[in-house]
């Protein structure tokens, strides 16, 4: 149906109801104007990574799915004028960083949400005239610093905040006439703003109060912008901010209840009516509850998030819900309740956390829940509960703690006493260990039976801080805060290392690459990692991300050939770095950047021939540097090190030269500066890129061909990882 010419596809005026399939991937201009398209789906423009101009005006588009423009990385101009858009999806332009012209005029848009243009930072021309806009959320235009043309005329705007426009230095055309501007104290700023820009915002007039109706805003004196006494004192002249409210597509909203049960949602809907008292979000696929997800809904009394996939809850996910009576979170994947999660939920009567994977409770988790009547923690992974966890629950009548793997040691004695005094646990919670108490009801065991073995169980001792979270991993041994996984033929770090771990022993295993799994982000107490006696050849960038408390790493006896600073990213507190007995041949000038806390660095027994100038310059705390047992080539490239070793008061054990022959076994710092020479072809600097190819040769992967080149000496810069070297047909008199 469409016509294609070069990179232009023309489908205009064809009465199309949907965007046609199979638009060529190389399309740069697409004309779909003058059709009957009603909806833009997130797959309609998928893959059109070269599209620059998209014409969608004069259709009947009422819905644009979020992500519809995500692939349009090159999009520069988009025309959506003369459609039926009412709701403006947030984050619609997240992928269109090059968009500079956007026409949304002549639609029925009622509000501009705060994140409307997030991602489209290059917009220069934005047309929003002839809509029904009554609300522009604060910050909606904040990212649009390059805006030159903004048309908001012929809308229903009554109020605007100064924050919306005071960051547009390039604005040259601005139209705001034909709105319903109410010229009270909240709009006083606009008069000044327009006077400072006499060429923009022409004919902008007040529509109220009645005595200012028809007056040009720029001509009204500041003292005439007044509010009633009650309003004047309100929030120090803050304009009541509007917010964009709607019932999410697929949900039903009535009587202040938003019902989104079983709608396949993957995230919490935003911008719901602020008066809602109940949200039903059960049986969806929500994974994350972000910060302040429900904070606008001050009247919320019941929130049901059961049977989702929730594994991550922001600490302030439920902030501000002072009227909340019921919070239903059962049937999710919650492993931990962040600190302060339930802070301020003073009205909560029911808290259902059953059927999750909660492995610990902070001692203050429930401190504000004075009116809680029922707490269900049934079917979780709790091994212990710290004394005092339930002390704030003054109104508690029913508690479900069964189906948890409780360790009934001395740290759980208090719970038995508590349940004897308050027989509120109605689900029949039982011990899992020790074996002598296994399967017995906690509330029926005599308290003297709750004992600890000689070495107190750290897992339960630290439970109030949520370090009692995980059992000892299979193949490891856990004693105190040491987790010993040595000699187990491991080639990767076990999952579920306990959070309380301070020392992690992974030595004498089969590691070859230390992968960036993010494991250390979950180990806030970690101080020492032993990775000695493995087969590590590489450490991925970010492997130690999150290990900010680690102060000792042992990488002795591995197979590292080079060291780069990216390997050690995240080790801000590292004091000891042992790299003994590896295969390091060169130390670059940025090998150790970012390790400003390191005091002891051992490079003993490697194959280091050279060290780039300044290699240790960023190690501000260095006091011991072991460079012994390395075959240093004391040529001109190493002169700086002799000088540095003399100047620095660092214990080094006097590393010695191995080359050239006349300096063999001489301590580097004893070599006179003029003796560091690159004579007789000795200018090897093995820190030069390993992959370079001698100019006389050709290199393919690790094969180097230098045949028939009339060579008398070995060419310089042969890659160190060479596997095949062809030197036939040359003029060598000696074997090089």
């Amino acid at each position: 149906q469409c016509s294609c010419s070069g990179s232009t596809v023309d489908c205009h005026g064809l009465a199309l109801r949907i965007v046609p399939r199979n638009i060529p991937r190389n399309t740069e201009r697409l004309d779909l104007n003058g059709n009957n398209i009603t909806r833009i789906t997130k797959t309609d423009f998928a893959g059109l990574r070269h599209l620059r101009i998209l014409q969608l005006m004069e259709n009947k588009i009422s819905t644009i799915e979020r992500g519809a423009f995500h692939d349009l990385k090159e999009l520069e101009r988009l025309r959506l004028n003369r459609n039926n858009l009412q709701l403006f999806p947030e984050l619609l332009f997240l992928g269109t960083a090059k968009l500079y012209r956007l026409d949304l005029s002549e639609n029925q848009i009622q509000a501009i949400p705060r994140k409307a243009f997030r991602g489209a930072v290059d917009i220069k021309n934005l047309q929003l005239d002839y809509n029904q806009i009554s609300c522009i959320e604060d910050g909606a235009f904040r990212a649009l610093r390059d805006l030159e043309v903004l048309t908001l005329n012929n809308n229903n705007i009554t109020r605007l905040s100064v924050a919306s426009f005071n960051h547009m230095p390039k604005l040259r055309t601005f139209r705001l006439h034909s709105n319903n501007l109410y010229c009270d104290c909240h709009l006083a700023w606009l008069s000044d703003w327009l006077r400072q820009r006499p060429r923009v915002g022409l004919y902008t007039q007040c529509m109220g109060p009645s005595h200012l109706r028809g007056h040009n805003v720029a001509e009204v004196q500041k003292r005439e912008f007044v509010c009633s006494d009650e309003e004047e004192g309100h929030q120090s002249f803050m304009a009541p901010s509007c917010s964009v409210l709607h019932c999410p597509i697929a949900c039903t909203c009535s009587n202040n209840i938003v019902d989104c049960r079983g709608k396949g949602l993957t995230e919490i809907p935003t911008n719901l009516p602020e008066t809602i008292t109940e949200i039903r979000l059960e049986q969806n696929s929500i994974r994350v509850i972000p910060p302040g997800a429900f904070s606008p809904y001050k009247k919320l009394r019941r929130l049901d998030l059961s049977n989702n996939q929730i594994s991550e809850l922001a600490p302030d996910a439920f902030q501000g819900l002072r009227s909340l009576n019921s919070l239903v979170l059962y049937g999710n994947k919650i492993t931990e309740l962040p600190k302060s999660l339930f802070e301020g939920l003073f009205s909560l009567q029911l808290l259902l956390l059953n059927a999750n994977k909660i492995n610990c409770l902070r001692v203050d988790a429930f401190q504000d829940l004075h009116n809680l009547n029922l707490l269900s923690l049934y079917d979780n992974k709790l091994q212990t509960v710290a004394k005092g966890t339930f002390s704030a629950l003054r109104a508690i009548q029913t508690m479900h703690l069964a189906q948890n793997p409780f360790i009934c040691d001395c740290h759980l004695k208090w719970l038995a006493d508590y349940l004897h005094t308050n027989p509120i646990e109605t689900s029949g919670a039982r011990c899992t260990s020790p074996r002598r108490l296994a399967n017995k009801r906690i509330g029926q065991i005599k308290s003297k039976k709750f004992r600890c073995s000689g070495t107190e169980d750290y897992r339960s001792k630290l439970s109030g801080d949520c370090f009692a979270d995980l059992a000892c991993p299979e193949k490891c041994r856990c004693e105190g805060t040491t987790v010993d996984c040595s000699n187990q033929k491991l080639n990767k770090i076990p999952d579920h290392i306990p959070q309380y771990t301070a020392e992690l022993r992974l030595n004498n295993n089969e590691f070859t690459v230390l992968e960036a799994t993010g494991i250390f982000k979950k180990l806030p107490q970690l101080r020492k990692i032993n990775l000695s006696n493995n087969k590590i050849t590489d450490i991925e960038e970010g492997a130690f991300e999150g290990a900010s408390g680690v102060n000792e790493i042992l990488l002795t006896s591995n197979r590292l050939e080079n060291v780069q600073h990216k390997m050690f990213k995240g080790l801000e507190s590292l004091k000891t770095l042992m790299l003994r007995s590896n295969r390091i041949s060169c130390v670059g000038n940025d090998s150790f950047t970012g390790l400003g806390s390191v005091r002891l660095l051992s490079l003993y027994d490697n194959q280091i021939t050279t060290v780039a100038p300044g290699a240790f310059g960023t190690l501000h705390s260095l006091s011991t540097l072991n460079l012994l047992a390395n075959p240093f080539n004391c040529n001109c490239h190493l002169a700086w090190l002799g000088e540095w070793l003399r100047r620095k008061r660092i214990v080094t054990g006097n590393p010695r030269c191995q080359k050239p022959y006349f300096l063999k076994e001489i301590p580097i710092q004893d070599v006179a500066i003029q003796d560091f020479t690159c004579d007789d072809g000795n200018d090897d600097n093995s820190c030069s890129p390993l992959s370079r190819c001698p100019s006389e040769c050709t290199c393919l992967d690790t094969v180097v061909r230098c045949s028939n080149k009339g060579l008398k000496v070995l060419p310089k810069g042969i890659p160190r990882d060479v596997t095949e070297l062809y030197l036939d047909g040359n003029q060598f008199t000696l074997v090089p």
Partner: antibody
Framework: QVQLVQSGAEVKQPGSSVKVSCKAS????????VSWVRQAPGQGLEWMGG????????NYAQKFQGRVTITADESTDTVYMDLSSLKSENTAVYYC???????????WGQGTLVTVSS | DIQMTQSPSSLSASIGDRVTITCRAS??????LNWYQQKPGKAPKFLIY???NLQSGVPSRFSGSGSGTDFTLTISSLQPEDFAIYYC?????????FGGGTTVEIK
């Protein structure tokens, strides 16, 4: 929103028991609290007890402990109130009610009149 | 149990009148007080929760106030459909308890 539909009026002999049902329509109430409140003729309202269907365990007012049993059938979204050892002073309208917390009653059934008379 | 006392037990008023009903708790219940309206032969209807919050669909002429032990329900301008019995109820502690009711009749 949830609508609560109760079973019909009952006339019972003293000493017998009565079982009143309350069915939810317009949405499951498996994780809601469902309470029973009674009102004797010309009298005020009196809370008897409540249940959360997914747990099955009920919570009773001291006054009714031992004589009232509240149960739930999740599969049919129905809650039952069983009152035994009936006396003439148990003649009342029995309401089921549900709400956002244990003790707030947003929605009410239409009521079931139980008359105890020989 | 917490006792709830309503006053007056009945009152007569005309259409358009401002009507005030009070409710007193035998101990501090913070703001955990609800108001219900009941018409003859009907189930109670939820009006106000947490002392001052209007339930959805309830006309704005109804308002509630108070905290601690003393609470008030006010009807700013009585309408024909407002003639009924009004109950307060505390939701602070078990068992929840109701006031004895206030009957609002036509004068």
């Amino acid at each position: 929103q949830v609508q609560l539909v109760q079973s019909g009026a009952e006339v019972k002999q003293p000493g017998s028991s009565v079982k009143v049902s309350c069915k939810a329509s317009g949405g499951s109430f498996r994780s809601y609290t469902v309470s029973w409140v009674r009102q004797a003729p010309g009298q005020g309202l009196e809370w008897m007890g409540g249940i959360i269907p997914i747990f099955g365990t009920a919570n009773y007012a001291q006054k009714f402990q031992g004589r009232v049993t509240i149960t739930a059938d999740e599969s049919t979204d129905t809650v039952y109130m069983d009152l035994s050892s009936l006396k003439s002073e148990n003649t009342a309208v029995y309401y089921c009610a549900t709400g956002s917390g244990w003790y707030t009653f947003d929605y009410w059934g239409q009521g079931t009149l139980v008359t105890v008379s020989s | 149990d917490i006792q709830m006392t309503q006053s007056p037990s009945s009152l007569s008023a005309s259409i358009g009148d401002r009507v005030t009903i009070t409710c007193r708790a035998s101990q501090n219940i913070n703001s955990y007080l609800n108001w219900y309206q009941q018409k003859p032969g009907k189930a109670p209807k939820f009006l106000i929760y947490a002392a001052s919050n209007l339930q959805s669909g309830v006309p704005s002429r109804f308002s509630g106030s108070g905290s601690g032990t003393d609470f008030t329900l006010t009807i700013s301008s009585l309408q024909p459909e407002d003639f009924a019995i009004y109950y307060c109820q505390q939701s602070y502690r078990s068992p929840p308890t109701f006031g004895g009711g206030t009957t609002v009749e036509i004068k």
